[in-house]
């Protein structure tokens, strides 16, 4: 397992919400990506392929998510101060082998300007 800080902008704020970007190498074909808040699994997305190369995408802990060919974005809405925490992208690579797990993360700071529906 590889642990490290994300070497890219992991948090993108918009409209009182945040997009948490979890990147993976282009070469990765099949994987599970989990978003952890502290040690708790908030969201996950699994991409696998069958024997006919058909893609299956599954979520056991569903969040609004977006898949591209080198990242999974998880979206959190209605931000408040309780969202401030360490967030980690836990990537399990199934294909290509060998099986590997990588953990990258960062701290989500919540500032007044990023909160939804602030009281003026």
């Amino acid at each position: 397992e590889i642990n490290g800080s994300a070497n890219y902008e992991m948090f993108i704020f918009h409209n009182g919400g945040v997009q948490i970007l979890c990147k993976y190498p282009d070469i990765v074909q099949q994987f599970k990506m989990q978003l952890l808040k502290g040690g708790q699994i908030l969201c996950d997305l699994t991409k696998t392929k069958g024997s006919g190369n058909t893609v299956s995408i599954k979520s056991l802990k569903f969040c609004h998510s977006q898949l591209s060919n080198n990242s999974v974005s998880f979206f959190l809405y209605n931000l408040d101060h309780s969202h401030a925490n360490y967030y980690f992208c836990n990537l399990s690579i199934f294909d290509p082998p060998p099986f590997k797990v990588t953990l990258t993360g960062g701290y989500l700071h919540i500032y007044e300007s990023q909160l939804c529906c602030q009281l003026k």
């Epitope: 070469i27 074909q29 099949q30 696998t48 392929k49 069958g50 024997s51 006919g52 190369n53 058909t54 299956s56 599954k58 199934f94 294909d95 290509p96 082998p97």
Partner: antibody, heavy 117, light 111 residues
């Protein structure tokens, strides 16, 4: 250790039906696509059908489409193949196989289906 | 559907000698940096066993006398020094798209 055990084969008349089962153990069944592959006596391997981890995607060989139905029960760790309108050319050993992400990495011993009058 | 062909249909090789099996696909199996081509071994009365995946990667526990090569439409399985336990039928298989298909098999015997 991964184990796949097929059952349900036997002798059936043309036009008849049969349901094959494959009991899986030794791995997290609900994490894997599963397949059926058949082999007629003295012949080569022919892919029949597959199903994704949750049972929401199923694919079929043109030879069996519309006649065979693949399904799974993840609570029972079991894969099924419902075979209807059977023909003499469906006579074969039917293997249950785990699709290990990039290859069939585990196979059962097979169950023989004979379609004959 | 992609058609897989194998040559020869059968071959007999002396113990310790090299055996070479060819597999050809009717269209390229290369996607990105991967060839979606697999080799299986089937001994009499047994289910098939995975040997090589992605054209050239040996499966866990497969002896290093087995090697796979090739790219695109032309692939080769080589047994560098044939052993008695290698007597079997060898199948190539693609998973480039649906339906996945197998080659007709090549029977390897001892001369």
């Amino acid at each position: 250790e991964v184990q796949l055990v097929e059952s349900g084969g036997g002798l059936v008349q043309p036009g008849g039906s049969l349901r094959l089962s494959c009991a899986a153990s030794g791995f997290t069944f609900s994490d894997y696509w599963m397949d059926w592959v058949r082999q007629a006596p003295g012949k080569g391997l022919v892919w029949v059908s597959n199903i994704d981890e949750s049972g929401s995607i199923a694919e079929y060989s043109p030879f069996v489409k519309g006649r065979f139905t693949i399904s799974r029960d993840n609570a029972k760790n079991t894969l099924y193949l419902q075979m209807n309108s059977l023909r003499a050319e469906d006579t074969a050993v039917y293997y249950c196989s785990r699709w290990g992400r990039f290859a069939f990495d585990s196979w059962g011993q097979g169950t023989l289906v004979t379609v004959s009058s | 559907d992609i058609v897989m062909t194998q040559s020869p249909d059968s071959l007999a090789v002396s113990l310790g000698e090299r055996a070479t099996i060819n597999c050809k696909s009717s269209q390229s199996l290369l996607s990105g940096s991967f060839n979606y081509l697999t080799w299986y071994q089937q001994k009499p009365g047994q289910p098939p066993k995975l040997l090589i995946f992605y054209a050239s990667t040996r499966h866990t526990g497969v002896p290093d006398r087995f090697s796979g090569s090739g790219s695109g439409t032309d692939f080769t399985l080589t047994i560098s020094s044939l052993q008695a336990e290698d007597v079997a039928v060898y199948y190539c298989h693609h998973h480039y798209n649906a339906p996945p298909t197998f080659g007709p098999g090549t029977k390897v015997d001892i001369k």
